[in-house]
């Protein structure tokens, strides 16, 4: 390893040697901040090297060939600790016949543009000008690691210095830290930790809940295989090198569990046969929700207590429960599952469906003429209670009278009491078609199948009734 000893360029207090303190460079009248130099007169003897030389084609007035130009040797490898200051330089003596020369600094093949910590100083003599390009970093970081070179352009020729390799040493630096994980109880999993120097080697110790896991360190990178956990644990890794140790972030390893039940359920909307609910899922147990189950049972204490189950996807936390009875009370519970299992059911909530229009027509509709022949009597049976879908408020009767060239429809409303009605004969020698619908506050139900009766001309008497059969009596 080459020591960080500067190559003596000039006797006396000239700058240009390696400095690791923060004293400023000697400021001379010709010093300038990182800019091209204009050159004049005679040469200063140095120690040219054979690599990266340019043989200038220009000759003096006496046509004597000029010596090859090259940067002088300087320190090749500087090792220092993070946050320390460093200064290094390259120097060259250039015959004054060359004009407009520039020195630029490059790091790892990329030019360091606008670097405020580079300074170029010129020391003109009769025949040559000594140029010293200094580069200083006040507080080195790892990112300053690399190979630095000077480049000089003269007459389209490029002169390149030997590289100066800067090695910043410090505490280990993590390139891969363990990650938080959600794991299944008693199931093995791996954690990875990787750290780099310099200096190398870097050794890894693993820590679980503040206690070291491995007695002997492992060389970085290290993979820790945990055979399984029964409860949450915090893992970290320690990276050690000659400079000291660095501790990674602590990561929590959670044990997957069944989820918590939802924290809220909302009844968004109710209709006669459906209830729209939404819910806020509880804690997911460190495992994504897969689906949810809505359990519905009739709240009526006389019901048989059977539970309807509706399964749905976990998202969007919204479900329309369908196929419900109208004007009924229900208890609803929501449960969700992840890969481990189902949550408990949420507390049971109450919801009601609204009234709807009856879903079936009145049954067993019978129509006949009464003795006076001035009226038509209609009788029916109310729809089954379960299909009334609400509280019956009455019936709507449609009667259509048809005779040659005439058709006339009339609608009548009758109260809910009883199951008979009487309508006046509108036209003789005509057919009367009767249909009846049940009515609730939720609306008008379907009309019954038509029942027809012929109304004879005056003087005819036909008492035979017409009817629609009740279901099962056909």
């Amino acid at each position: 390893r080459e020591e960080a000893k500067p190559y003596p360029l000039f006797p006396g207090p000239f700058p240009g040697s390696l400095q690791t303190d923060h004293t400023p460079l000697l400021s001379l009248p010709h010093a300038s901040g990182y800019q091209p130099a204009l050159m004049f007169s005679p040469t200063q003897p140095g120690r040219p090297h054979t690599g990266n030389v340019a043989i200038p084609q220009v000759t003096s007035v006496e046509s004597k060939p000029l010596p090859p130009l090259a940067f002088k040797h300087t320190v090749g490898h500087i090792i220092l600790s993070e946050h320390k200051g460093v200064k290094f330089n390259c120097s060259i003596s250039v015959p004054n016949i060359y004009q407009d020369t520039t020195i630029s600094w490059w790091k790892d093949g990329k030019e360091l543009l606008g670097a405020h910590h580079a300074i170029t100083q010129f020391y003109p003599d009769d025949e040559v000008t000594a140029i010293i390009a200094s580069f200083s970093i006040t507080s080195v970081q790892r990112s300053d690691n690399g190979s630095y070179i000077c480049k000089m352009k003269i007459n389209n020729e490029e002169i390149v210095s030997d590289p100066i390799y800067i090695e910043v040493q410090g505490l280990p630096h993590f390139t891969k830290q363990p990650e938080s994980m959600n794991v299944t109880r008693n199931t093995a999993f791996n954690l990875t930790c990787q750290a780099v120097g310099p200096p190398e080697p870097v050794n890894i110790f693993w820590v679980q809940n503040s206690s070291r896991v491995n007695e002997q360190p492992e060389k970085s990178p290290s993979v820790l295989t945990v055979p399984g956990l029964t409860e949450m644990a915090v893992f970290s890794c320690e990276a050690h090198n000659d400079k000291g140790l660095t501790v990674s972030k602590g990561v929590q390893i959670n044990i997957k569990a069944i989820p918590s039940p939802p924290t809220e359920v909302s009844i968004r909307n109710s209709t006669a046969h459906s209830i729209l609910i939404s819910w806020v899922p509880g804690f997911d147990g460190y495992s994504p929700f897969r689906n949810c189950s809505i359990q519905v049972k009739e709240a009526d204490p006389l019901s048989n207590g059977s539970v309807m189950i509706f399964n749905t996807s976990a998202l969007p936390h919204l479900y329309q429960i369908k196929q419900l009875q109208a004007l009924a009370n229900y208890s609803i519970g929501v449960s969700c599952m992840n890969e481990i299992g189902w949550s408990a059911v949420s507390p049971w909530i109450l919801a009601s469906t609204t009234e709807g229009a009856p879903s079936v027509a009145p049954l067993n509709v019978t129509v006949f003429l009464n003795e006076s022949s001035d009226n038509v009597d209609i009788r029916w049976m109310k729809p089954p209670t379960k299909q009334q879908d609400g509280e019956l408020v009455g019936y709507r009767i449609s009667h259509v009278w048809q005779s040659a060239g005439i058709s006339k429809e009339l609608l009548e409303e009758v109260g809910q009491n009883g199951s008979r009605a009487r309508i006046s004969v509108q036209v003789h020698n005509a057919t009367c078609t009767v249909r009846i619908a049940a009515v609730t506050r939720g609306g008008v139900g379907p009309f019954s199948d038509p029942v027809k009766i012929f109304i004879p001309a005056h003087g005819w008497v036909d008492y035979a009734p017409s009817s629609t059969p009740a279901p099962g009596n056909a």
Partner: antibody, heavy 128, light 111 residues
């Protein structure tokens, strides 16, 4: 660790305003309804109001118009804005997490099932 | 507004005693069972003991139990321990109303 911390209490003159805060840690306000409950010195508990996870608020009938509950989910903090304060509002004000809540959106009310986590409380003294 | 009435308001008992506190509601509690019991010690916030009238909250000792439905509820401590001297509150909600009602409290003190 799941925790609730109230702040903002103090001495205030009658007619004045005060805003209490409830800082939540260990769980999210976007997943839980929250409630305020108060307790006058030497007296029992009195419910003030609730804010659901979606931000709907419901207040005790006596608090409507003077007390407003709000929250900032990004800060995981709930607030109680108290205006036109009176001497009888002197109490320790607790924030509490609602373990389960049912909302009846169509009818604009909701029901608390239980309050399963409480803060230590902050004392509000209304006095001239 | 619905009201919850606790009795007694104060109860003197000794360690090891069986203690019963009742809570009566002026109308049926939501779902007949959405009633909770809370324990509060001086200078401390309340702590949930029982919910759904009879379900023990997490970490609550089994000597505490609850029962009842509709409008009548009971909290029982089967064998009073020194740590149980405190004030107990019942609370519940009602259909059609957002108000969460608390009972007046029962102070259990050392005899």
């Amino acid at each position: 660790e799941q925790q609730l911390v109230e702040s903002g209490g103090g001495l205030i003159q009658p007619g004045g305003s005060l805003r209490l805060s409830c800082a939540v840690s260990g769980f999210s306000l976007s997943s839980n309804a929250m409630s305020w409950v108060r307790q006058a010195p030497g007296k029992g508990l009195e419910w003030v109001g609730i804010i659901s996870s979606s931000g709907s608020t419901y207040s005790a009938s006596w608090a409507k118009g003077r007390f407003t509950i709000s929250k900032d989910s990004s800060k995981n903090t709930m607030y109680l804005q108290m205006n036109s304060l009176r001497a009888e509002d002197t109490a320790v004000y607790f924030c509490a997490r609602v373990g389960f809540f049912v909302g009846y959106g169509a009818y604009d009310y909701g029901i608390i099932h239980r309050l399963d986590l409480w803060g230590q409380g902050t004392l509000v003294t209304v006095s001239s | 507004d619905a009201q919850l009435t606790q009795s007694p308001s104060t109860l003197s008992a000794s360690v090891g005693d069986r203690v019963t506190i009742t809570c009566q509601s002026s109308k049926s509690i939501y779902n007949n069972n959405w009633l909770s019991w809370y324990q509060q010690k001086p200078g401390k916030p309340p702590k949930l003991l029982i919910y759904d009238a009879s379900d023990l909250a997490s970490g609550v000792p089994s000597r505490f139990s609850g029962s009842g439905s509709g409008t009548e509820f009971t909290l029982t401590i089967s064998s009073l321990q020194p740590d149980d001297f405190a004030t107990y509150y019942c609370a519940g909600g009602y259909s059609g109303d957002s108000d969460y009602a608390f009972g007046g409290g029962t102070k259990v003190e050392i005899k």
